[in-house]
């Protein structure tokens, strides 16, 4: 029961996480105009991975796609790639985990196969979550670097009179969505891996087998051999499951969010 709950919860958490990763990837507000030095701007700029937008005083918002591939910064391309890899892995993981769910019976699928699939999907979710967190963190780092660079040479003018204020960008909502979604996908993946340990056959007790030695009527009974792996191919033997799944997985550390002025 606990295994089913853990697996189900892991699936739901991962599903929410992947939906969040997709949402973050599609969102336009990865970076938003910093209003600290110009709080009264009537023109508000914000940018996503795929297009940049401007909201005008009329309330009208105009967005323009980045219609170039080669002209874009390598970092942006890298972030796009990480997010897409995260989505693809997550989607495959979801597909695999649906078939792996203990509450869903598909034909005569063995528990060992379900355990295998649960572990596979769990690993996929973990990698998916890490990809999202990495992508968002790379973009955030890029923003922080650009922020301080633009602060250093913010005012460009003649004779000390300010002519132009360079637009600075700060963290957009998509970054926080991405971090949370990546974290959820990661947690979901870990839960799937934990559930897999519960699904896997820990021990296999072999039935006593009589060996008839020539000329002797002696029954040879070997002791209950321990299965070397959780996924024994000897499926005809009775399987004994370890109900209490042990969590020996490494503790996952999360990236800290650095506040800046």
């Amino acid at each position: 029961m606990a295994v089913t709950a853990c697996q189900g919860l892991g699936f739901v958490v991962s599903l929410i996480g992947i939906a969040g990763i997709i949402a973050a990837t599609c969102m336009d507000q990865w970076s938003t105009q910093d209003l600290y030095n110009n709080p009264v701007t009537a023109v508000f700029n914000y940018q996503g991975l795929w297009r940049s937008c401007v909201r005008e005083s009329s309330g009208f918002t105009e967005c323009r796609g980045y219609f170039t591939l080669l002209g874009l910064p390598a970092m942006l391309q890298a972030v796009r790639a990480l997010m897409i890899v995260g989505i693809v892995l997550g989607a495959i993981g979801l597909l695999v985990s649906i078939f792996a769910l203990k509450c869903i019976r598909i034909g005569s699928m063995e528990d060992s196969a379900k355990a295998n699939m649960t572990l596979t999907s769990g690993i996929m979710f973990i990698v998916s979550g890490l990809c999202a967190i990495a992508g968002v963190s790379v973009f955030a780092n890029m923003l922080v670097t650009n922020f301080w660079m633009s602060t250093a040479n913010m005012y460009t003018g003649m004779g000390g009179m300010v002519q132009t204020v360079q637009t600075r960008y700060t963290f957009g909502a998509a970054l926080f969505v991405g971090w949370v979604a990546g974290g959820l996908t990661l947690i979901g993946g870990v839960m799937m891996c934990i559930a897999c340990r519960g699904l896997a056959p820990e021990e296999t007790n072999y039935k006593a087998v009589s060996y008839h030695a020539s000329g002797h009527s002696v029954a040879y009974k070997p002791g209950g051999f321990k299965a070397s792996t959780g996924f024994g191919s000897n499926t005809k033997n009775k399987k004994i499951y370890d109900g209490g799944a042990r969590t020996e997985d490494e503790v996952q550390s999360y990236p800290s969010k650095h506040d800046y002025v």
Epitope: Q33, N38, V40, T41, A42, V43, N45, S52, V54, E56, S57, S58, G59, F60, E62, R64, V162, Q163, T164, V165, Q166, T167
Partner: antibody, heavy 115, light 113 residues
């Protein structure tokens, strides 16, 4: 087509309040901000502020902030601008405007403040 | 606040001649986010509300005759009427659409010589 129809002329005494309405039609009311502009007789244009019909958020010119209040009723696609503690220099035509680059204007409401 | 200064205050031009109105802002109206200048030009005739001519410094509004054109960047802008017509007699205003409070120029009265 897009139309902004304003309420009729008003005559008020100093210290009183006036509420001008601006009924919008021909577009999605919540899509664009409604701005208010003052034009004193023979004078230029002066921006009072705007209201965002979608969320009710507003932004005021500091000159009018403590006396002007902008509201909206999305059910009847109407924006309102109330000016309190009227003075003689508030005598002007008040316009509502919307659209990209203020493409659409109301016909104007003349408010006369006289004792 | 951004101060908008229009020149001249009034202008008399012969029919068919070119009319040029200047507008200077105290701060740049250039938005680096989309590389556009947020300046608007209006035409106002007596007893009427202002009519939008040009937005984003150079984009003509739909239905505006192509004899009207806007140019300039940063702090200096120009409205040009290439061939003055009788119906162009009006007061012309420029407006800062970049920063709150939105501010207007004092207006330029265009007349026929």
């Amino acid at each position: 087509q897009v139309q902004l129809v304003q309420s009729g002329a008003e005559v008020k005494k100093p210290g009183a309040s006036v509420k001008v309405s601006c009924k919008a039609s021909g577009f999605t009311f919540t899509s664009y901000n409604i701005h208010w502009v003052k034009q004193a007789p023979g004078q230029g244009l002066e921006w009072i502020g705007y209201i965002s019909p979608g969320n009710g958020g507003s932004n005021y010119n500091l000159k009018f902030k403590d006396r002007a209040t902008m509201t909206r009723d999305t059910s009847i696609s109407t924006a309102y601008m109330e000016l309190s503690r009227l003075r003689s220099d508030d005598t002007a035509v008040y316009f509502c405007a919307t659209g990209r680059g203020f493409a659409y204007w109301g016909q104007g409401t003349l408010v006369t403040v006289s004792s | 606040d951004i101060v908008m200064t229009q020149s001249p205050d009034s202008l008399a031009v012969s029919l068919g001649e070119r009319a040029t109105i200047n507008c200077k802002s105290s701060q740049s109206l250039f938005n680096s986010g989309n590389q556009k200048n947020y300046l608007i030009w209006y035409q106002q005739k007596p007893g009427q509300p202002p009519k939008l001519l040009i937005y984003r410094a150079s984009t003509r509004d739909s239905g505006v005759p192509d004899r009207f054109s806007g140019s300039g960047s940063g702090t200096d802008f120009t409205l040009t009427i290439s061939s003055l017509q009788a119906e162009d007699v009006a007061v012309y205003y420029c407006q800062n659409d970049y920063s709150y409070p939105l501010t207007f120029g004092g207006g330029t009265k265009l007349e026929i010589k």
